[in-house]
Interface confidence: low
């Protein structure tokens, strides 16, 4: 009897997701079975299914079976949260690029490499043909997209609607181009999903046909993701378990990228004189072992045969025969010289103190000329002398060049958060340094509060309770979604970048978040011809102890009557006391039959001696936060709109004057809210927004 | 699980030894081998996965093999010397999806190789 | 890749406590895949604990395991007449990418 085999590595799985259709025309087909692999089976078999099914869910509860002739990307289709249902995608359908000689591509690309848009198979204009779908069942030759039914060399491609051309392939990229891997690959999260000789993967959340320690659970950070290919274990590249029974695991091909900097997740805190942590990111000169014998050369196998070689372990810095850390080791060691001894630990070498020495500044740090040189983040500061061009372009006068030696950290641009510097990473352009103000220095940054001396104008889930329905312009308000569920509130302050709340990440994967725009509905319920549904490319931190974020997302909002920014205050301007500012927000209102609608609170401003004072002198308020109290008792932002806004008008302008962040109760009467002053960090958000790339639409 | 085969040998014959269980699907369990010289420790020679696919330490490698059938282990030692002589032991190694240790949690009772001249 | 077992033998008396260290050569061993195996005279080891500190089925608590990376404990509390055996550790490293065990010297523990 032949092994059928198993398809689910086929398919893409979204945890805890399932998908509901919208528009009623879209069939579905149920049936009671025992496993997700059944399901699997079926649907790429399309045995029994009155249509091509591109995706099913699993109902672990039920143990049934939805298969789909959709999948989340088609429209009349949206996502939902649910424990049990798992769905699982067939890859075909959504990846953007093409395996071999792209036979099983069935993306939506539909435009041939010259630009000419391709002529739907299922029409004889303006070239007949006999590439009908009825003759090539299987091969998805739907609409007018690229296909490649007969696996010609080339590609997939399509009759063209230019009837001087007849046909012509499409310019899809091999997979093995689009991905690359920085380093060893370690923190590589792509979708190479076959290694170098072609055997498809096994999925990470299966034992079979190779049992494995490598358990999704186990190990959430290393991005164990369906049958992808990863470096979970300091390997000199991503590999996987093959679907091979005699061939237990292989390398992938995925190239090293163009720009081979270091991702901005789990970069090591490069030290040169002492070990910070496991000292993975020691790059000194000690090269004896704590005993004074010498180490031997990483690129020398003699006298110890080794595979710790730097062509193995690039991004590890194996240079000489200097002692370093490159698999996680408990400290930096080396390979020794003398044959009898294969390793050591280099227990000489000094644990680092973390607060720097006496190393702090005074005011804003304008004048720090310490000698850090490194971000709070770990990166290594770039030299100032390379990066002059970009700082003129965000500072409008002369920068001290004599203050700006080497690559310390300094703050040429009067930035009110500290010494910062560039780091040469062009995903992360520049950073604060880990320098504190100094012990009882309390010269403010910015200087009375209290007193309107700027104009603000220019020419547990917090939620809001007990307020009334909105539904006027407010369409830079922001959904974040985590695992497909409302988390938390946003405020869109450019077409890329949301403003929200450092507690709303409650997991490092981007992929767990999206952020939905042109919303009324927490649900997107009567939104679907106005919603955006963007992915989060990035995240920003705010300044230490500023609870902010910036979010960047993957592509640029597009901006229209549902959605739209919101401006921001000018730097360090108060808003006068008793100013009418209301506050947004989804989640738990008070309301038993709660509605799921954006409710809107309104607020009035309060000064800070006098909102210490309601907090019954238990909080000292200090420059970078602002308050404001409910005009209704009992009304005001709640555990669950973290992130959202605080928005107040001045001269017919609204503005984001105030983050909602947890931590200082929930809607209790005669306690005012106290809220992150978006004024004092203004300068920051306008500095990230000028230095950090964004996608183009 | 009850390992049998071990006996006298002189060196250089070869011998095999057969686990045979009983209540364990072997297409469901990874199975190994371990071994006891007289008065030593515990010394870890390889395991066979549900698949058949068999994974060897250093020092075993190429002078023993192991295989199976649907109810049974075997390890062949293909070239012994007096330095093989030990009880072998035959284990189940732990299957809860949850861990990630290869824990051996059920043991045969051994069997005795000598191998002498 | 060598396990050390440290002290042996260790005596301990009844109701008394025992403890035994387990150190890696290297901490290239998947963190907290360890074992701990309790063998008496004439007889198989019995799994005692997996996954660093797990407690196998049937096995009273008062044997209780810890540690990560190199280091790792048994630790023994209330000791009994029957605890008198050899205790074994055993960890996992990466061959590749396959998985190889190996196992510690042994630690007798003698109870008075």
């Known amino acids: 009897q032949r092994k059928r085999r198993n398809t689910i590595h086929e398919f893409k799985k979204s945890a805890k997701t399932t998908l509901i259709k919208i528009d009623p025309a879209l069939k579905i087909k149920t049936k009671k079975v025992n496993t997700a692999d059944q399901c699997a089976n079926r649907c790429t078999r399309n045995k029994g299914l009155p249509f091509t099914c591109k995706a099913f869910v699993f109902d672990k509860a039920r143990k049934q079976c939805l298969w789909f002739p959709f999948n989340s990307m088609s429209s009349g289709v949206k996502k939902e949260f649910g424990h049990e249902f798992d769905l699982y995608e067939n890859k075909d359908y959504i990846r953007n690029c093409i395996i071999g000689k792209g036979r099983s591509y069935k993306g939506t690309v539909s435009i041939t490499k010259s630009g000419i848009k391709c002529q739907p198979w299922s029409s004889m204009i303006p070239h007949e043909h006999s590439f009908l779908p009825s003759s090539y069942r299987g091969k998805d030759l739907q609409e007018n997209y690229c296909r490649n039914p007969r696996g010609e060399e080339g590609g997939p491609w399509c009759f063209t609607s230019n009837p001087e051309v007849r046909y012509e392939v499409c310019d899809i990229p091999q997979c093995s181009e689009v991905e690359c891997m920085t380093c060893n690959g370690e923190s590589y999260r792509g979708l190479m999903d076959h290694t170098e000789s072609g055997k498809i993967c096994q999925r990470w959340d299966h034992q079979t046909p190779h049992r494995h320690k490598f358990l999704p659970e186990r190990y959430p950070d290393k991005g164990f993701d369906d049958n992808y290919c990863r470096n979970p274990d300091g390997q000199p590249r991503p590999w996987c378990y093959t679907l091979d029974p005699h061939t237990r695991w292989e390398y992938c091909a995925i190239k090293t990228c163009a720009d081979n900097t270091m991702n901005d997740t789990d970069v090591p805190l490069e030290t040169t004189e002492c070990i910070q942590g496991q000292g993975e990111g020691y790059r000194g000169t000690v090269n004896t072992i704590w005993n004074g014998i010498p180490c031997q050369r990483w690129d020398s196998q003699y006298p110890h045969e080794h595979d710790m070689t730097p062509e193995n372990f690039k991004c590890k810095d194996l240079r000489e025969n200097y002692c370093r850390n490159p698999d996680g080791s408990e400290s930096p060691w080396c390979f020794t010289t003398d044959p009898n001894i294969r390793v050591g630990y280099c227990s000489q070498i000094p644990n680092c103190d973390m607060s720097h020495g006496q190393d702090c500044y005074r005011g804003n740090g304008k004048n720090y000329m310490g000698n850090l040189s490194q971000t709070r983040s770990g990166l290594t500061c770039s030299m100032w002398d390379k990066n002059m061009e970009d700082l003129h372009r965000h500072i409008f006068w002369e920068p001290d060049a004599s203050k700006l030696n080497e690559n310390y950290c300094r703050n040429p641009d009067d930035d009110a958060h500290g010494p910062w510097c560039y780091t040469g990473n062009p995903l992360i352009p520049w950073d604060y340094c880990p320098i504190s103000r100094c012990e009882g220095d309390t010269t403010p940054t910015i200087v009375n509060l209290d007193h309107p001396v700027i104009s603000c104008a220019k020419t547990k889930q917090l939620r809001v309770v007990n307020g009334i329905p909105t539904r006027t312009n407010i369409g830079w308000m922001v959904s974040l979604r985590y695992r497909n569920k409302h988390i938390c509130g946003g405020s869109l302050i450019k077409e890329s970048w949301v403003l929200t709340a450092r507690q709303c990440f409650p997991s490092r994967d981007l992929k767990d978040y999206e952020a939905w725009l042109g919303i009324h509905d927490v649900h997107g319920r009567g939104d679907e011809k106005c919603k955006q549904v963007l992915n989060v490319s990035q995240l920003v931190y705010g300044p230490e102890g500023s609870d902010l974020v910036l979010m960047k997302l993957a592509r640029p909002a597009v901006l229209d009557d549902f959605v739209s920014t919101i401006d921001l205050p000018n730097y360090g301007c108060t808003i006068p006391e008793k100013t009418s500012c209301s506050v947004y927000g989804w989640g738990y209102t008070g309301l038993i039959n709660y509605d799921g609608l954006l409710r809107v609170a309104h607020l009035y401003i309060m000064g800070n001696e006098k909102c210490s004072q309601h907090h019954r002198g238990k909080v000292t308020l200090n420059e970078s936060e602002i308050c404001a109290g409910a005009e209704k008792i009992g009304s005001g932002p709640c555990e669950g709109d973290y992130g959202g806004p605080l928005v107040c008008e001045q001269h017919k302008m609204r503005m984001v004057l105030g983050v909602i962040v947890p931590g200082r109760g929930c809607a209790i009467p005669n306690r005012p809210g106290i809220f992150v002053r978006v004024a004092y960090y203004a300068k920051w958000i306008h500095k990230i927004i000028l230095t950090y790339k964004v996608p183009q639409s | 699980v009850e390992e049998s085969g071990g006996r006298l040998v002189p060196p250089g014959t070869p011998l095999t030894l057969t686990c045979t269980v009983s209540g364990i699907d072997l297409s469901s369990y990874a199975m190994g081998w371990v071994r006891q010289a007289p008065g030593k420790g515990l010394e870890y020679i390889g395991m066979?996965?549900?698949?058949?696919s068999t994974y060897y330490a250093d020092w075993a490698k190429g002078r023993l093999t192991i295989s199976k059938t649907p109810t049974t282990v075997d390890l062949e030692i293909t070239s012994p010397t007096t330095e093989d002589t030990a009880t072998y032991f035959c284990a189940r190694l732990i299957d809860e999806r949850s861990t990630y240790s290869y824990a051996f949690d059920l043991w045969g009772q051994g069997t005795l190789v000598t191998v002498s001249s | 890749q060598v396990l050390t077992q440290t002290p042996s033998p260790v005596s301990a008396a009844v109701g008394g406590t025992v403890t035994i260290n387990c150190q890696a050569s290297q901490s290239f061993y998947n963190n907290g895949a360890f074992s701990w195996y309790q063998q008496k005279p004439g007889q198989p080891p019995k799994l005692l604990i997996y996954d660093a500190s797990t407690l196998a089925s049937g096995v009273p608590s008062r044997f209780k395991g810890s540690g990560s990376g190199t280091q790792f404990t048994l630790t023994i509390s209330g000791v009994q007449c029957g605890d008198a055996a050899t205790y074994y550790c055993q960890g996992e490293f990466s061959c590749g990418s396959a998985d190889c065990v190996a196992f510690g010297g042994g630690t007798e523990v003698v109870v008075k």
């Open positions: 066979i996965d549900v698949s058949g």
